[in-house]
Interface confidence: medium
C-alpha cells in the first residue's frame, strides 16, 4: 500500500502511478511552466526525495473529453 509520503523508484514508481492514474495514463515529465523553463520529472520528485499522493496525481494524463 502507498504510504502518505515516501520515495518511489523504478518499477515501484510505475506501479504506483498506474494505480493512482488508472485509465488516464501518466507522464514521466510535465511540460515546463511559464515560471520555470525547465520541465519537472516524477523520477526526480518522487525517487530523489519523498513525495505524496497529490504530487503523484499531477503526473496523470488528462482524460479525453467525450463529445
Amino acid at each position: 500500500a502507498y504510504r502518505p509520503s515516501e520515495t518511489l523508484c523504478g518499477g515501484e514508481l510505475v506501479d504506483t502511478l498506474q494505480f493512482v492514474c488508472g485509465d488516464r495514463g501518466f507522464y514521466f515529465s510535465r511540460p515546463a511552466s511559464r515560471v520555470s523553463r525547465r520541465s519537472r520529472g516524477i523520477v526526480e520528485e518522487c525517487c530523489f526525495r519523498s513525495c505524496d499522493l497529490a504530487l503523484l496525481e499531477t503526473y496523470c494524463a488528462t482524460p479525453a473529453k467525450s463529445e
Epitope: 523508484c9 525517487c47 530523489f48 526525495r49
Partner: antibody, heavy 119, light 111 residues
Framework: QVQLQESGPGLVKPSETLSLTCTVS????????WSWIRQPPGKGLEWIGY???????NYNPSLKSRVTISVDTSKNQFSLKLSSVTAADTAVYYC?????????????WGQGTTVTVSS | QSVLTQPPSVSGAPGQRVTISCTGR?????????VHWYQQLPGTAPKLLIY???NRPSGVPDRFSGSKSGTSASLAITGLQAEDEADYYC???????????FGGGTKLTVL
C-alpha cells in the same frame, strides 16, 4: 549479485564520437535507473546522465547537446554516446545503478574505463 | 566550481573522529533532495557509503554516519583507521539544474 562492466575504445580522436557500453550481469536492467559518470584525471566526479529502461532520460545540461544514452534490454546493456569530443572529455567513465532502496543513491558501479581524446 | 561545496582536504590521527561537510543551497539539499556519500579509494571506483542522508548500505561499518540539516549535510567517521584514507564525495539532485550534482570531493589523510 549485480555487476557492471564498461567497454569501448580507450582512444578517441578529437571531433569524433565516444561510444561506450555498460553490460549488466547478475540482474535485469528493468525496474532500475542507470547512470553514467565520469572523472577527469586528478579531478572529481561529474554526472553525465541517467535513464529508466522505459525510456525516461535526463542529461547533464552542460553536456546535453552532445550526449545520448540508449538501452538494449535484450542484451542487458546500455550505452553512452558523446559527440564532438575534445581533450576535456578525457576521463575515466563509470556506469552505475540507481535504486529505490538507496533513495536514488548509486549502489553498484562498474570498475571504470579510461578514455583518452587525442589525435 | 561544484554546486555542492566540500573542503578539499581533512586529516586526523588513527582513532580520532573527523567530519566532512557538504554545503548546498535551496535548490538541492535545502529542497529536500536526499544526500548520498561515496568513498573512492586510490585507483578504484567510488563506493556508496551513505544513502538517503543517513543510511548505511550493508557491509559499511557503523563508524561511518551521515546527517543533514537545512542546506547542508555532513559525513562523520569515528575511530579513524588507515584504510579510511580516500576521497569522499557527496551527491544530491539540483532542481535548478535539473540534474544530479556531486561535491568537489574531500581527500581524507590519516596521519
Amino acid at each position: 549479485q549485480v555487476q557492471l562492466q564498461e567497454s569501448g575504445p580507450g582512444l578517441v580522436k578529437p571531433s569524433e564520437t565516444l561510444s561506450l557500453t555498460c553490460t549488466v550481469s547478475g540482474g535485469s536492467i528493468s525496474s532500475y535507473y542507470w547512470s553514467w559518470i565520469r572523472q577527469p584525471p586528478g579531478k572529481g566526479l561529474e554526472w553525465i546522465g541517467y535513464f529508466f529502461y522505459s525510456g525516461y532520460t535526463n542529461y547533464n545540461p552542460s553536456l546535453k547537446s552532445r550526449v545520448t544514452i540508449s538501452v538494449d534490454t535484450s542484451k542487458n546493456q546500455f550505452s553512452l554516446k558523446l559527440s564532438s569530443v575534445t581533450a576535456a572529455d578525457t576521463a575515466v567513465y563509470y556506469c552505475a545503478r540507481i535504486t529505490g532502496t538507496t533513495k536514488g543513491g548509486m549502489d553498484v558501479w562498474g570498475q571504470g574505463t579510461t578514455v583518452t581524446v587525442s589525435s | 566550481q561544484s554546486v555542492l561545496t566540500q573542503p578539499p582536504s581533512v586529516s586526523g590521527a588513527p582513532g580520532q573522529r573527523v567530519t566532512i561537510s557538504c554545503t548546498g543551497r535551496s535548490s538541492n539539499i535545502g529542497a529536500g533532495y536526499d544526500v548520498h556519500w561515496y568513498q573512492q579509494l586510490p585507483g578504484t571506483a567510488p563506493k556508496l557509503l551513505i544513502y538517503g542522508n543517513s543510511n548505511r548500505p550493508s557491509g559499511v561499518p557503523d563508524r561511518f554516519s551521515g546527517s543533514k540539516s537545512g542546506t547542508s549535510a555532513s559525513l562523520a567517521i569515528t575511530g579513524l583507521q588507515a584504510e579510511d584514507e580516500a576521497d569522499y564525495y557527496c551527491q544530491s539532485y539540483d532542481s535548478s539544474l535539473s540534474g544530479s550534482v556531486f561535491g568537489g570531493g574531500t581527500k581524507l589523510t590519516v596521519l
